[in-house]
């Protein structure tokens, strides 16, 4: 899916009102400093192609975030603000309904939402501090 | 466990040319911009180029461009420097490091490869 | 093209602060990065953005920027501090990285 013509204002604000709330609730009892940076991301677009990736593509470490509350909620942020978007996942909820639920919160999956959380702080900031 | 390791390094005769590659491992390779940084015997640091996270631009140093070509390939995770018409002045260790960029601006380079040595002597 | 001018050498004895500088044209506009490397070693990032530090690089390491004029200022110098350190930017109007000269650090 192309993330281009999202409405990132709207993206942004349910970001800071609801998901921020959720992925630092999961992160809770560790500091963003236990997790050195994996991934970053260069423009919004591209943050939000990353964030889709880490948040629904199960890994072999950690294959339950799709399941977490900060994750439906990205989703339905994306699903609103970004045209299209809802028709491109409908293949992917079904096959992700067929696997088994896993419910522990891996130490990968810790440092998974950790980078998360990187790749969400890239895409609020319009700029860099300075040029 | 987040790694760069040049490799290609060693002696060459002016005029000719060398290929140095870089293996990235550890983080998510496609998502950060690639640099090559070299230091010649005794002196500071030079920059030499650097390589969007898409591959899609790339940027030189004055002092190589039109002989070396910077290039990666993402499926790999590999970074390359292909130098032609090499001068004695290319002497030096040959880094690569990756920084995050925002838009077209480059960050710190926050990891670096220990170097490989090219050496362009007759 | 821009250019970034440091002292070639600085020296500091054990316990005290040591101040590197580096000059260049309006640079207070531009976000400044500082790198220590130690013979036959790799550079490393110890401050980034003016005066963020990277979580393994001790408190100790701080910086500056405005003006004309960014500083790098370690404090509480130790001997294995002795390093060459390096200001470098990214010039947006030329689309380059540029390394200051560097300076060798000298714990007395």
């Known amino acids: 899916y192309d993330f281009t013509n999202c409405d990132f204002q709207k993206i942004e604000a349910d970001y800071l009102r609801t998901i921020s709330k959720d992925l630092i609730t999961y992160m809770s009892g560790t500091k963003s400093t236990d997790f050195n940076n994996t991934v970053s991301c260069s423009n919004r677009p591209h943050c939000l192609t990353e964030i889709q990736s880490l948040t629904f593509n199960p890994t072999p470490r950690c294959a339950s975030l799709a399941k977490e509350m900060f994750a439906r909620k990205t989703k339905a942020t994306l699903a609103l603000w970004c045209p299209g978007y809802s028709e491109t996942q409908i293949n992917a909820t079904q096959a992700m309904k067929k696997r088994r639920k896993r419910k522990v919160t891996t130490n990968k999956c810790l440092e998974q939402v950790s980078q998360l959380l990187g790749l969400w702080r890239r895409f609020i900031r319009t700029l860099l501090k300075k040029q | 466990q987040m790694q760069l390791v040049e490799s290609g390094g060693g002696v060459v005769q002016p005029g000719r040319s060398l290929r140095l590659s870089c293996a990235a491992s550890g983080f998510t390779f496609r998502t950060y911009g690639m640099h090559w940084v070299r230091q010649a015997p005794g002196k500071g640091l030079e920059w030499v180029a650097v390589v969007w996270y898409s591959g899609s631009y790339t940027h030189y140093a004055d002092s190589v461009k039109g002989r070396f070509t910077i290039t990666r390939d993402n499926s790999k995770n590999t970074l390359n420097l292909q130098m032609n018409s090499l001068r004695a002045e290319d002497t030096a260790v040959y880094y690569c490091?990756?920084?995050?960029?925002?838009?077209?601006?480059?960050?710190?380079?926050?990891?670096w490869g220990q170097g490989t040595m090219v050496t362009v002597s007759s | 093209s821009y250019v970034l001018t440091q002292p070639p050498s600085v020296s500091v004895a054990p316990g005290q602060t040591a101040r590197i500088t580096c000059g260049g044209n309006n640079i207070g506009s531009k976000s400044v990065h500082w790198y220590q490397q130690k013979p036959g070693q790799a550079p490393v990032l110890v401050v980034y953005?003016?005066?963020d530090r990277p979580s393994w690089i001790p408190e100790r390491f701080s910086g500056s920027n405005s003006g004309n004029t960014a500083t790098l200022t370690i404090s509480r110098g130790e001997a294995g501090d002795e390093a060459d350190y390096y200001c470098?930017?990214?010039?947006?109007?030329?689309?380059?990285?540029?390394f200051g000269g560097g300076t060798k650090l000298t714990v007395l």
């Open positions: 953005d003016d005066s």
């Open positions: 490091s990756r920084s995050p960029q925002w838009e077209d601006i480059f960050e710190a380079m926050d990891i």
């Open positions: 470098q930017v990214w010039d947006s109007s030329s689309s380059l990285v540029v």
